[in-house]
């Protein structure tokens, strides 16, 4: 014999000794029907808002309080924004590798240093994780660019960057 | 609407060079990596390197460099792959594709259709 | 190397429930975010799952991601199967040098 709490919808609990559907009560849900218990709605405070609201049939999401991101499957722990210097990773911020900055406070991604011989400029003032190289006014006679080579703890897959 | 499309198919004899045209449009260009991926007959992605349009910064596989060279026309939003030195194996589709800068490990939102490259004597 | 594994094939009827594996060989598999694409034939890949755990919008709910630290690997579960579902699945995630890893590709065939 089919129980009748296969029956019941999202947003309702159903014991098997009396198969009745009921409704979650309140602050808590259930995204399938027909379980014992409802879920207890999470609870978005400290560095947590409140990204979507809980409802009988879904769980409350959080996002974390501005200055902060979040780390972790469904936002399980809020993380101090990255510093310039820094990018985002799953791991949370990590410097800029070799070759490349960010210049954001907050936001961004790690991008490489402008290429100043692509201009025909030279380099004026090498660039650091924060900043970007400053380029030089165009070079009148060419010299052949040298290719130095980036370590693999360097740029993006150990990559090459030209310079003059 | 984010787009990027690429230009059409091309056959080329080996040795020769291939340059393929990406044009993005619905969104910033210089603010977002684009990323080179081809995909040869029956097998998997591979990555070939990316650029930041922003300042037409490069980075390469090490598989690829030498050979692929990256650029950028900020003023039409189009991103260029030329691969010399063309032989049989770079018969492949190329693919573009966007990452959005959420993260340096994100992953890539909007792809181009593909660009079928064919390297036949 | 980093290298990311997938089943060469992997085949279930509709309407139940497969996992396509995506075995990191070193390092950590929760150092970095893995995403997963779908292929059809003769299209460009399109994202399932990304960061994780998450799904872009239109992607229906049947997709999910996760993680096993235990066993250095992600997994795309694909449930009430369709035959639309019927694609090769790519997982992607990134080396140390944040230098873009893509598994082989998984071709999931619906059967029937």
């Known amino acids: 014999v089919q129980n009748s709490c296969d029956n019941c919808q999202p947003g309702t609990f159903c014991r098997k000794y009396n198969p009745v559907c009921k409704s979650c009560p309140p602050s808590t849900f259930s995204s399938i029907g027909g379980q014992p218990n409802c879920n207890i709605c999470r609870v978005c405070a400290g560095y947590f808002r409140f990204k979507k609201f809980c409802s009988s049939t879904h769980n409350a999401e959080c996002e974390c309080i501005e200055g902060f991101h979040c780390l972790g499957p469904q936002c399980t722990r809020c993380e101090k924004d990255c510093r310039p210097g820094q990018e985002l990773t799953k791991q949370g911020c990590k410097t800029c590798s070799l070759g490349t900055f960010n210049d954001q406070n907050g936001t961004g991604v790690c991008r490489p240093w402008t290429n100043c011989s692509l201009d025909g400029r030279s380099v004026l003032k090498t660039g650091t994780t924060e900043k970007d190289v400053v380029c030089g006014p165009p070079v009148v006679s060419f010299s052949p660019s040298t290719t130095i080579s980036v370590t693999p703890e360097g740029g993006p897959g150990g990559h090459s960057l030209q310079v003059l | 609407e984010v787009q990027l499309v690429q230009s059409g198919a091309e056959v080329k004899k080996p040795g020769s060079s291939v340059k393929v045209s990406c044009k993005a449009s619905g969104y910033t260009f210089t603010s977002y990596y684009i990323y080179w991926v081809r995909q040869a007959p029956g097998q998997g992605l591979e990555w070939i390197g990316n650029?930041?349009?922003?300042?037409?910064?490069?980075f390469y596989g090490e598989k690829f460099m030498g050979r692929a060279t990256f650029t950028a026309d900020t003023s039409t939003s189009t991103a260029y792959m030329e691969l010399s030195s063309l032989r049989s194996e770079d018969t492949a589709v190329y693919y573009c594709a966007r990452r959005p800068d959420y993260s340096g490990d994100d992953y890539f939102d909007y792809w181009g259709q593909g660009t079928l490259v064919t390297v036949s004597s | 190397n980093v290298m990311l594994t997938q089943p060469h094939s992997v085949s279930e009827s509709p309407g139940k429930t497969v996992t396509i594996s995506c075995k990191l060989n070193s390092g950590n598999i929760g150092s970095y975010y893995v995403h997963w694409y779908q292929q059809r034939p003769g299209s460009s890949p399109t994202t399932m799952i990304y960061r994780d755990d998450k799904r872009p919008d239109g992607v229906p709910d049947r997709f999910s991601g996760s993680i096993d630290s235990s066993s250095n690997s992600a997994s795309l579960t694909i449930s009430g199967l369709k035959t639309e579902d019927e694609a090769d699945y790519y997982c992607h995630s990134y080396d140390s040098t944040i230098t873009p890893v893509f598994g082989g590709g998984t071709k999931l065939t619906v059967l029937g």
């Open positions: 650029i930041w349009p922003g300042n037409g910064g490069t």
